[in-house]
C-alpha cells in the first residue's frame, strides 16, 4: 500500500469513468487510472480508503488501467483517487473523481411554470417535487451546458431560470439526493421550447436521448447553481 | 448467480496451519477477482488477501509471509494457505467475488465484492 511521502515527485495520474459517472443503481461502472507507460502499479482509493490495485504485464505498452465496478451501489459512490508508481516514486494524486449513484428509493415530479414553451426573455422556474424527505434537489440539462444546478429542500425545491434565452432551450430532469453521492430515480423529462427572436429556436434538441449514460456535466456547487467545480465533475479530471 | 461455499476451518493451536478452501458455482469463475475476508468477534471484517484473474496477489500486512492465497480456475477453487496461525487469527473467514471483472485488477475493499460466502470459523487457541 502507498506510503505518503514529501518526495511525490511524478506527474499526477488523470482518472475518469465510463459510461458516466452517474451510475444506475446495479449497474456497472468502468474507473479508468491514465499515468505513465513505466508504470509498474496502479493504486486506486475510495473515501480514502484503499480500494484496488493493478500491476500491468511489462509485455503490454499500457499507459493506463481499468477497475471494474461490476454492481453500483450506495456503498461504491463517492470520491475515488487514484496513484501510479514508476520505479521507487509514487505520482501525485490524481484529481478527484466523484462517483453518484442513481435509481434509489423515489421518482421526483419535475414542471416548470408558466409553461414548456415559452417566450424568449420570459421568466421560467422549474419545480422539483419528491414525496420522500431529501436535503438536496439536482437539475440536469440533458446534452446542453454541461451543467447541472442544486437546490436545498425538504420535499420540493425551485430552479429560477430568469428571463430565458435560446441557451436554456432543451430536456432537463431533477434528482433528489439522500447524500451528495446518493440520488433517486430521475423525474420524467420536460423539455423546454423557446419561440420567438431572431431565428426560429423551438425545436427541441436533436438527438434526445432518455439514458443517462450520455449525460456529461459539471456539478455547481453553491445553492445558485452558478459556480462550477469542472475538476471535480468531469468525466476526465486532469487540470 | 454466483454461489459461493467456504470449506477447511477449524481448531487449530498457535503455530499451526490450515488450508481453507472456497468452491465457486457457475462458468464466470476464470472472469472473477477472488479475495478472503476475516471478522473477529466484536470487531468489523477485514481484508486478508486477494487474487486477480492473472493469479497476481495482495495480501494484508498482518498475514504478509504466513498466508497464501491461491485458485484453481479448473476446479472454481480459490484457497488460502494459513500457516504460523496466531491467536488474533481467530475469525469467521468470508471468501468474496467481484464478478466479472476484467484485466489484472487485484480488489482490497469490500464494497468491490459483489459476492459473498457464508464463512468458515477459523478458531486459534492452546
Known amino acids: 500500500q502507498r506510503i505518503n511521502t514529501e518526495k511525490e515527485t511524478l506527474p499526477k495520474p488523470i482518472i475518469w469513468a465510463k459510461p458516466s459517472i452517474m451510475v444506475t443503481n446495479g449497474n456497472s461502472v468502468n474507473i479508468w487510472c491514465q499515468g505513465a507507460q513505466s508504470a509498474s502499479e496502479y493504486q486506486l482509493y475510495f473515501e480514502g480508503s484503499f480500494f484496488a490495485l493493478e500491476r500491468p504485464k511489462p509485455s503490454r505498452s499500457m499507459n493506463k488501467v481499468r477497475f471494474f465496478i461490476s454492481q453500483m451501489t450506495s456503498h461504491t459512490a463517492g470520491i475515488y483517487t487514484c496513484f501510479y508508481q514508476s520505479g521507487e516514486l509514487w505520482s501525485k494524486s490524481s484529481n478527484p473523481l466523484k462517483l453518484v449513484v442513481t435509481g434509489l428509493y423515489d421518482t421526483p415530479n419535475l414542471w416548470v411554470y408558466p409553461r414548456p414553451e415559452v417566450t424568449l426573455g420570459e421568466n421560467v422556474t422549474f419545480f422539483c417535487q419528491l414525496k420522500t424527505a431529501t436535503s438536496k434537489f439536482f437539475l440536469l440539462k440533458e446534452r446542453g451546458s454541461n451543467h447541472i444546478q442544486n437546490k436545498y429542500g425538504n420535499i420540493q425545491a425551485e430552479f429560477p431560470m430568469g428571463p430565458v434565452t435560446r441557451a436554456h432551450r432543451g430536456t432537463y430532469r431533477c434528482f433528489g439526493s439522500y447524500n451528495d453521492y446518493a440520488w433517486s430515480f430521475p423525474s420524467e423529462p420536460v423539455t423546454l421550447l423557446i419561440t420567438g427572436g431572431v431565428e426560429n429556436s423551438s425545436l427541441a434538441p436533436t438527438d434526445p436521448t432518455s439514458s443517462l449514460d450520455y449525460w456529461e456535466f459539471d456539478l455547481s456547487t453553491n445553492e445558485s447553481g452558478l459556480q462550477k467545480d469542472s475538476a471535480f465533475w468531469d468525466h476526465t479530471t486532469q487540470n | 448467480e454466483v454461489q459461493l461455499v467456504e470449506s477447511g476451518g477449524g481448531e487449530v493451536q498457535p503455530g499451526g496451519s490450515l488450508r481453507l478452501s472456497c468452491a465457486a458455482s457457475?462458468?464466470?469463475?476464470?472472469?472473477?477477482?477472488m479475495g478472503w475476508f476475516r471478522q473477529a468477534p466484536g470487531k468489523e471484517r477485514e481484508f486478508v488477501a486477494a487474487i486477480s484473474r492473472s493469479d497476481d496477489t495482495y495480501y494484508a500486512e498482518s498475514v504478509k509471509g504466513r498466508f497464501t492465497i491461491s485458485r484453481d480456475n479448473a476446479k472454481n477453487t480459490v484457497y488460502l494457505q494459513m500457516s504460523s496461525l496466531r491467536a488474533e487469527d481467530t475469525a469467521v473467514y468470508y471468501c468474496a467475488a467481484v464478478v466479472p471483472t476484467y484485466g489484472n485488477a487485484i480488489y482490497v475493499h469490500s464494497a468491490a465484492y459483489n459476492y459473498w460466502g457464508q464463512g468458515t470459523l477459523v478458531t486459534v487457541k492452546p
Open positions: 457457475g462458468r464466470t469463475f476464470a472472469s472473477a477477482a
